[in-house]
């Protein structure tokens, strides 16, 4: 039998996405990052 349609079975937990930019000095430009749930991932 074919399966009926359902979701993936894995819950999606909403987390706050925070983009930030930090000035690290005139000759190094800026670091741009993405923080997900308190962890910097980019």
């Amino acid at each position: 039998d074919a399966e009926f349609r359902h979701d993936s079975g894995y819950e999606v937990h909403h987390q706050k996405l925070v983009f930030f930019a930090e000035d690290v000095g005139s000759n190094k430009g800026a670091i741009i990052g993405l923080m997900v749930g308190g962890v910097v991932i980019a």
């Epitope: 039998d1 399966e3 009926f4 349609r5 979701d7 993936s8 079975g9 819950e11």
Partner: antibody, heavy 124, light 112 residues
Amino acid sequence: QVTLKESGPGILKPSQTLSLTCSFSGFSLSTSGMGVGWIRQPSGKGLEWLAHIWWDDDKYYNPSLKSQLTISKDTSRNQVFLKITSVDTADTATYYCARRSINSVVPEDYFDYWGQGTTLTVSL
Amino acid sequence: DVLMTQTPLSLPVSLGDQASISCRSSQSIVHSNGNTYLEWYLQKPGQSPKLLIYKVSNRFSGVPDRFSGSGSGTDFTLKISRVEAEDLGVYYCFQGSHVPLTFGAGTKLELK
């Protein structure tokens, strides 16, 4: 609050086409994950699932009746339709529509709201 | 098709009794996503079915805790710990994993 209400012809003759309408309120079929299905019940007997339609127009049918069934929707009017061609006396039943959605965050994957049902009699 | 076999078909009880209804599926109803879409519905005379239990053992909102569901794979059970008058009616098990979706034949819970 969520409500669903079925409507139909009441009486048909064998070989005619049954057209049913499910009019609902309290939710929208434009919402991702939302779906509406049809279930029927001959008087004094058990329940038989017929078809289901999803917000994205994906459709599922009972294979034993698939050649006779067509499910469709009018999202803007909050209505779902079921057509059954070439009805017979065996199609005499109460027809229910019910909401069933798929949602990864909130566990709504069940028939949580049902209409009151509309009765069809197929008779010569 | 997945055949859902309910036993017993009729269950005479006295108020306050414990009641147990069995449902057996003809094949596994574990979906590929890992969930088992086994539900229990109660239909009272002249009314549409009402959801009691979903995914084997989860009580739907507003359902009293005297109702409990259990089981896995192909064997499932609905238990009512102390039957009340409002519990009388026909109970249907249902599988939503495979097409066609199928119901059991129903178990009529009635007074002795």
